[in-house]
C-alpha cells in the first residue's frame, strides 16, 4: 500500500483538523522547550506544504518520508543549540538516525513550570476570543509535559476539553460546571500518560515480543469469546499502532488506530458482545471506548487447560513446532479463564510455563517432569493476592494520606539514594492504589492493583534512568518487566546506605505553608518525612509517627497565630531540636 506522497496520504486520511493537531503534538513532544508561537508557525508551514502535495503528489519534496519532512522542519529552529544543547547534533544525522536521536532526547521530566489554572472568567474569555488557539495551546502544553502521551487519545482529550468550555462558559455558575470537569480531565490525562509510558517502555526496552505478550493477555481477558486467531490479529495491529506512536510516527499511528477501530466494529460478532455501544460513537470517542471496554462474559463451557498443556503427549512436539505460537495459545487460554488475575501475573505464569517446558522437553520423559507444572503456579498466584489483601487492609485502617506516608517510609528505606521529589511523587501515586482498587469486588482487586502499580513503578524506572543513583533500582527496572513489582516488593532496608547528614534548612518552614492547598501541604509534609527517613533510615514507625504528629501540630499552631512568620521562626527550631532528640 505505497503512496507517491506519504504526507498527502496522511492529510487525506486524517483530515486537516486532526493532521494539524497531530503535527503540533509531534513537534511539542520533540522540542519541549520551544514557545507555543514557534510550534504553531512550524505546523502551519507543514500543513501548507501538505496541501500542495494533496493538489499534486508529484510536486517537489512531496515524495519525502514524514521523518525527513518533520525532521527538516524541526532543524530550522534557530535557537536549537542554545535551548537544547546536544540535541542540536541530531540535525547533522541522516534519517533514520536523526529521528532516533530526537527520540532519545525526549525528556520525561522537563524543567517546565507547573500549569497554573487561571480564573474561570479569564479562561472563558480566552476560549470565546479564539477557540482554535485555545485548544492548540492545550495540546501543546500537555504534549510538551508528556512526551509519550498517546497522540490520538490526546485529540480525544482536547475534544472533551473543548466540550467542557462550550458547555460551562454558558452556564449560570461557570466555575461549578467547569472546575470538576477540568479536574477529571487532568487526573484522567495523567493516568493515560502514565499507562502509555509503560507501553512505550515495554516496546523500547524489552522489544515487541514483550508488548505482544502483554497484549495477548489483556485482550484475551477482554475478549474471552474471541478465537485465538482473532486475538492474534488484534495484537498484531495494536502492536503496530503503539510502535508507531512510541516512535514518534503520530500520523501513521492515528491512521492505523482508526483502521483498527473500524475493523473491530465490522467484526464485533467474532470479538465481543460489549463493543456495540462503542461502535455507534464518532471516531475519537469510539477508539477511546474500545480501548476501555469492559471484559466480555467468559464462555460457560471452557474445558480444563490441563488436557492440552499438561496431560497431552504432544506438549513438547507442539512447543518445538512453534514455541511462540504455543506459548501464545497457552497465555490466551489462561487469560480468558482468569479476568481475576493481573496481566503481569498471567505473564509470570506464562514465563514459568515456558521455563518448565525448556527444562522438561529436554528430558527423556518430559511428562514425568512437567506433570506438576500447574502446582508450581500456586505461589506465583498467592504472592500478589496476599500483597493486595495486606495493603488494602492497611489502606482501610489508615486512610489515603497515612497510607501514602507508610509507603513513603517503606520505599525510602528500600532505595534512599533516589531523589526526594521522585520518592514523594512515586509513593503518593502508589498510595492512590487504595482508593482506586480496594473498594472493588475481590475478583477485580488484583488486576486493578498490580497493573496500576506496574504503571507507577515504570514512572520510577523512567525517572531513575535519566539520573541513575541506585543499583537496586536499575536491577529491578531492567532485569524483567513482569517481575518489576515483585522485585521492588522484595527490597529490604538498604544496609549499605550512609545516612544523609542532618540539614536544618530542610526542616525550616515559613508562613507560606498556611496558604497552601491541602494537597500542597501534604506534599510539604511528605517531603519532610522522606528527608527524615534519609537522615535516620532505622527510625521506627512509632518514632516517625511521633515526629510527624508534632510537625502537624506545629504547623497548625503557627497557622492559627496572629504573627505566623514569628511563630514559625520561634517554634521551628524547637520542633527540629525535639525531632532530633526523638530520633536519637
Amino acid at each position: 500500500d505505497t503512496h507517491k506522497s506519504e504526507v498527502a496520504h496522511r492529510f487525506k486520511d486524517l483530515g486537516e483538523e486532526h493532521f494539524k493537531g497531530l503535527v503540533l503534538v509531534a513537534f511539542s513532544q520533540y522540542l519541549q522547550q520551544c514557545p507555543f508561537e514557534e510550534h504553531v508557525k512550524l505546523v502551519n508551514e507543514v500543513t501548507e506544504f501538505a496541501k500542495t502535495c494533496v493538489a499534486d503528489e508529484s510536486a517537489e519534496n512531496c515524495d519525502k518520508s514524514l521523518h525527513t519532512l518533520f525532521g527538516d522542519k524541526l532543524c530550522t529552529v534557530a535557537t536549537l543549540r542554545e535551548t537544547y544543547g546536544e540535541m542540536a547534533d541530531c540535525c547533522a544525522k541522516q534519517e533514520p538516525e536523526r529521528n532516533e536521536c530526537f527520540l532519545q532526547h525526549k525528556d520525561d521530566n522537563p524543567n517546565l513550570p507547573p500549569l497554573v489554572r487561571p480564573e474561570v472568567d479569564v479562561m472563558c474569555t480566552a476560549f470565546h476570543d479564539n477557540e482554535a488557539t485555545f485548544l492548540k495551546k492545550y495540546l501543546y502544553e500537555v504534549a510538551r509535559r508528556h512526551p509519550y502521551f498517546y497522540a490520538p487519545e490526546l485529540l480525544f482529550f482536547a475534544a472533551r476539553y473543548k466540550a467542557a468550555f462550550a458547555e460551562c462558559c454558558q452556564a449560570a455558575d461557570k466555575a461549578a460546571c467547569l472546575l470538576p470537569k477540568l479536574d477529571e480531565l487532568r487526573d484522567e490525562g495523567k493516568a493515560s500518560s502514565a499507562k502509555q509510558r509503560l507501553k512505550c517502555a515495554s516496546l523500547q526496552k524489552f522489544g515487541d515480543r514483550a508488548f505482544k505478550a502483554w497484549a495477548v493477555a489483556r485482550l484475551s481477558q477482554k475478549f474471552p469469546k474471541a478465537e485465538f486467531a482473532e486475538v492474534s490479529k488484534l495484537v498484531t495491529d495494536l502492536t503496530k499502532v503503539h510502535t508507531e506512536c512510541c516512535h514518534g510516527d503520530l500520523l501513521e499511528c492515528a491512521d492505523d488506530r482508526a483502521d483498527l477501530a473500524k475493523y473491530m466494529c465490522e467484526n464485533q460478532d467474532s470479538i465481543s458482545s460489549k463493543l456495540k455501544e462503542c461502535c455507534d460513537k464518532p471516531l475519537l470517542e469510539k477508539s477511546h471506548c474500545l480501548a476501555e471496554v469492559e471484559n466480555d462474559e467468559m464462555p460457560a463451557d471452557l474445558p480444563s487447560l490441563a488436557a492440552d498443556y499438561v496431560e497431552s503427549k504432544d506438549v513438547c512436539k507442539n512447543y518445538a513446532e512453534a514455541k511462540d505460537v504455543f506459548l501464545g495459545m497457552f497465555l490466551y487460554e489462561y487469560a480468558r479463564r482468569h479476568p481475576d488475575y493481573s496481566v503481569m501475573l498471567l505473564l509470570r505464569l506464562a514465563k514459568a510455563y515456558e521455563a518448565t517446558l525448556e527444562k522438561c522437553c529436554a528430558a527423556a520423559d518430559p511428562h514425568e517432569c512437567y506433570a506438576k507444572v500447574f502446582d508450581e503456579f500456586q505461589p506465583l498466584v498467592e504472592e500478589p493476592q496476599n500483597l493486595v489483601k495486606q495493603n488494602c487492609e492497611l489502606f482501610e485502617q489508615l486512610g489515603e494520606y497515612k497510607f501514602q506516608n507508610a509507603l513513603l517510609v517503606r520505599y525510602t528505606k528500600k532505595v534512599p539514594q533516589v531523589s526526594t521529589p521522585t520518592l514523594v511523587e512515586v509513593s503518593r501515586n502508589l498510595g492512590k492504589v487504595g482508593a482506586k482498587c480496594c473498594k472493588l469486588p475481590e475478583a477485580k482487586r488484583m488486576p486493578c492493583a498490580e497493573d496500576y502499580l506496574s504503571v507507577v513503578l515504570n514512572r520510577l524506572c523512567v525517572l531513575h534512568e535519566k539520573t541513575p543513583v541506585s543499583e537496586k533500582v536499575t536491577k529491578c527496572c531492567t532485569e524483567s518487566l513482569v517481575n518489576r513489582r515483585p522485585c521492588f516488593s522484595a527490597l529490604e532496608l538498604d544496609e549499605a546506605y550512609v545516612p544523609k547528614a542532618f540539614n536544618a534548612e530542610t526542616f525550616t518552614f515559613h508562613a507560606d505553608m498556611c496558604t497552601l492547598s491541602e494537597k500542597e501541604k501534604q506534599v510539604k509534609k511528605q517531603t519532610a518525612l522522606v528527608e527524615l527517613v534519609k537522615h535516620k533510615p532505622k527510625a521506627t514507625k512509632e518514632q516517625l509517627k511521633g515526629v510527624m504528629d508534632n510537625f502537624a501540630a506545629f504547623v497548625e499552631k503557627c497557622c492559627k497565630a496572629d504573627d505566623k512568620e514569628a511563630c514559625f521562626a520561634e517554634e521551628g527550631p524547637k520542633f527540629v531540636a525535639a525531632s532530633q532528640a526523638a530520633l536519637a
Partner: nanobody
Framework: QVQLQESGGGLVQPGGSLTLSCAAS????????MSWVRQAPGKGPEWVSA????????RYADSVKGRFTISRDNAKKTLYLQMNSLKPEDTAVYYC????????GSQGTQVTVSS
C-alpha cells in the same frame, strides 16, 4: 517448519540387526528429548525408546530392553536406533518424534522381520 526424516529400514531375518536414523530440521534439536515410536499393521502406535537432549538419559519399553539402543548426534541433528536380535513382532513402521509424542508427523521407515 519441523521436519523429521527417518531412514535405514528394510527387510531383515529374525536375529538380524538394523540401524535407523532420523534427520531433524526446523527446530532446536539439541534442546529436546526425542523418542522412537512404532506402529504395527492394524495396531495403535507404541512407544519404543526415548533419550534426553544431551544423550545421557535413555529409556526403553520392556519389549525392546537389552536389544535396542537409542543415541543421538546433536551436531548432526540426527537421532539413531540400533536394533539387534530382531524378532518378527518388531515388524512395524518406525518413526521418530519430539518428546514422548505418539503423533505421527512423518512417513516413517518400514522394518520387516521375516524369514
Amino acid at each position: 517448519q519441523v521436519q523429521l526424516q527417518e531412514s535405514g529400514g528394510g527387510l531383515v531375518q529374525p536375529g538380524g540387526s538394523l540401524t535407523l536414523s532420523c534427520a531433524a530440521s526446523g527446530f532446536t534439536f539439541g534442546s529436546f528429548g526425542m523418542s522412537w515410536v512404532r506402529q504395527a499393521p492394524g495396531k495403535g502406535p507404541e512407544w519404543v525408546s526415548a533419550i534426553d537432549s544431551s544423550g545421557a538419559d535413555t529409556r526403553y519399553a520392556d519389549s525392546v530392553k537389552g536389544r535396542f539402543t537409542i543415541s543421538r548426534d546433536n551436531a548432526k541433528k540426527t537421532l539413531y536406533l540400533q536394533m539387534n536380535s530382531l524378532k518378527p513382532e518388531d515388524t512395524a513402521v518406525y518413526y521418530c518424534t519430539i518428546g514422548r509424542s505418539t503423533s505421527r508427523g512423518s512417513q516413517g521407515t518400514q522394518v520387516t522381520v521375516s524369514s
